[in-house]
């Protein structure tokens, strides 16, 4: 708490102002108006203030606003905003993405803070939704941020939106995002024509079926090892060798560097070692001639 | 990141002048820069400051002898020091504000003789 002192002759505060810098702690308490002080809050981030000085105008504010800043207010705060703990944040209501935009600016360059965090919480929730112009917003602010959004808070994402998602922003994504992303992109992007097509929805196979890549396997894609390398095991272990060599095309050489490593060793442990040598590669580890297949999963679905 | 480089520092006699110059290399637009300094065994003060728009202010101390200004299209500040007196001996050190972050150069020693 800032002792509550008189403002000395002639330092009352008429607008926020540069000379303000020179004001110790509690003359900027005693001097400056809160009212002044939040209708010229965009002043602020041109005036090198001290963190101790940011902290009294920040109590000045509270003190005006103890239910939460309006928006007129928050767009404006600039650094201020560093200053601000998520239960301050948690009282906002920010409905306008020009708002959000001003206030991602401030934490630009920097690891998602928690305050940012919070931040993007109450907008998103606001909204109701993960709309395009959001989304668009937040991936160019950080590019992580759709993969650290759980499978639910993903589910209210809506296919129209997915046109923003650029390749970088699913790179830390795991399987049980991509399953929900997947089936959104593939409605997003389905009156595209097949190269076009494949292009889009690329980033987005590690949540594809089995059903899916057999379908991609007949239109000649040449999807690259790395696409490959990051579709479900599970999606890939029923693709026949013939599917595989399809939907690679001339990538299917780089099967043998990555015989050792999931999905590919999976799955050459699943085909016949005939098959296998159709391709040439060398890879080793088939089901023998002459041994029967049984198809456990089946068996059980039996009994 | 802002790098900013100082330069003009020196000793001088009392009554003497010095003018400092900070440049800033950065493309971000720069809000306000400004001049602190620190004496040894005191606090880091504020000398002077200038906005984008070109609005200046100035510690009770130094007024009416210190004059800042900048050259926006060298994202150049300077501060131009006269009738130096042995108080003003301090480290001088260049603050710019760029895109809502503050940073600071690395100080230039001022020496002020009786």
């Known amino acids: 708490e800032v002792e509550k002192t008189a403002c000395p002759s002639g330092k009352k505060a008429r607008e926020i102002d540069e000379s303000l810098i020179f004001y110790k702690k509690w003359e900027l308490e005693a001097c400056v108006d809160a009212a002044l002080l939040a209708t010229q809050m965009d002043r602020v981030n041109a005036i090198p203030f001290t963190y101790e000085q940011l902290d009294v105008l920040k109590h000045k504010l509270d003190e005006l606003y103890p239910q939460g800043y309006p928006e007129s207010v928050i767009q404006h705060l600039g650094y201020l905003f560093l200053k601000m703990s998520p239960e301050d944040i948690r009282k906002w209501n920010v409905t306008s993405l020009e708002t959000l935009k001003a206030l991602l600016e401030v934490n630009k360059g920097h690891e998602m803070s928690p305050q940012v965090a919070t931040l993007i919480d109450r907008f998103v929730k606001g909204r109701g939704q993960l709309d395009k112009d959001t989304l668009d917003t937040l991936t160019a602010f950080y590019p992580g941020y759709l993969c650290s959004l759980s499978p639910e808070e993903l589910s209210s994402v809506p296919p129209s939106s997915i046109w923003a998602v650029r390749p970088q922003d699913l790179d830390t994504c795991d399987p049980r995002q991509l399953d929900v992303l997947y089936p959104k992109a593939r409605l997003a992007f389905q009156n595209m024509n097949g190269s076009e097509y494949f292009v889009k929805i690329q980033s987005f196979l590690g949540g594809a079926p089995t059903e899916d890549l057999k379908a991609l396997s007949q239109q000649n894609v040449s999807m690259d090892l790395a696409t490959f390398m990051k579709l479900r095991t599970d999606a890939v272990l029923p693709l026949t060798v013939a599917e595989v060599q399809k939907l690679l095309g001339p990538h299917v050489e780089g099967l043998k560097a990555e015989e050792r490593h999931r999905p590919v060793r999976d799955w050459i442990l699943r085909q016949r070692q005939d098959d296998l040598d159709t391709l040439g590669l060398g890879l080793q580890g088939g089901i023998p001639n002459g041994y029967l297949v049984l198809d456990l999963s089946m068996q059980e679905a039996l009994s | 990141q802002v790098q900013l480089v100082e330069s003009g520092g020196g000793l001088v006699q009392a009554g003497g002048s010095l003018r400092l110059s900070c440049a800033a290399s950065t493309t971000s637009s720069i809000n306000s820069m400004s001049w602190y300094r620190q004496a040894q065994g005191k606090q880091r003060e504020p000398v002077a400051v200038?906005?984008?728009?070109?609005?200046?202010s100035y510690a009770d101390s130094v007024k009416g002898r210190f004059t800042i200004s900048r050259d926006n299209a060298k994202n150049t500040v300077y501060l131009q020091m006269n009738s130096l007196k042995p108080e003003d001996t301090a480290i001088y050190t260049c603050?710019?504000?760029?895109?809502?972050?503050?940073?600071w150069g690395q100080g230039t020693q001022v020496t002020v003789s009786s």
């Open positions: 200038i906005t984008d728009r070109g609005s200046t």
């Open positions: 603050h710019v504000i760029a895109d809502w972050r503050g940073y």
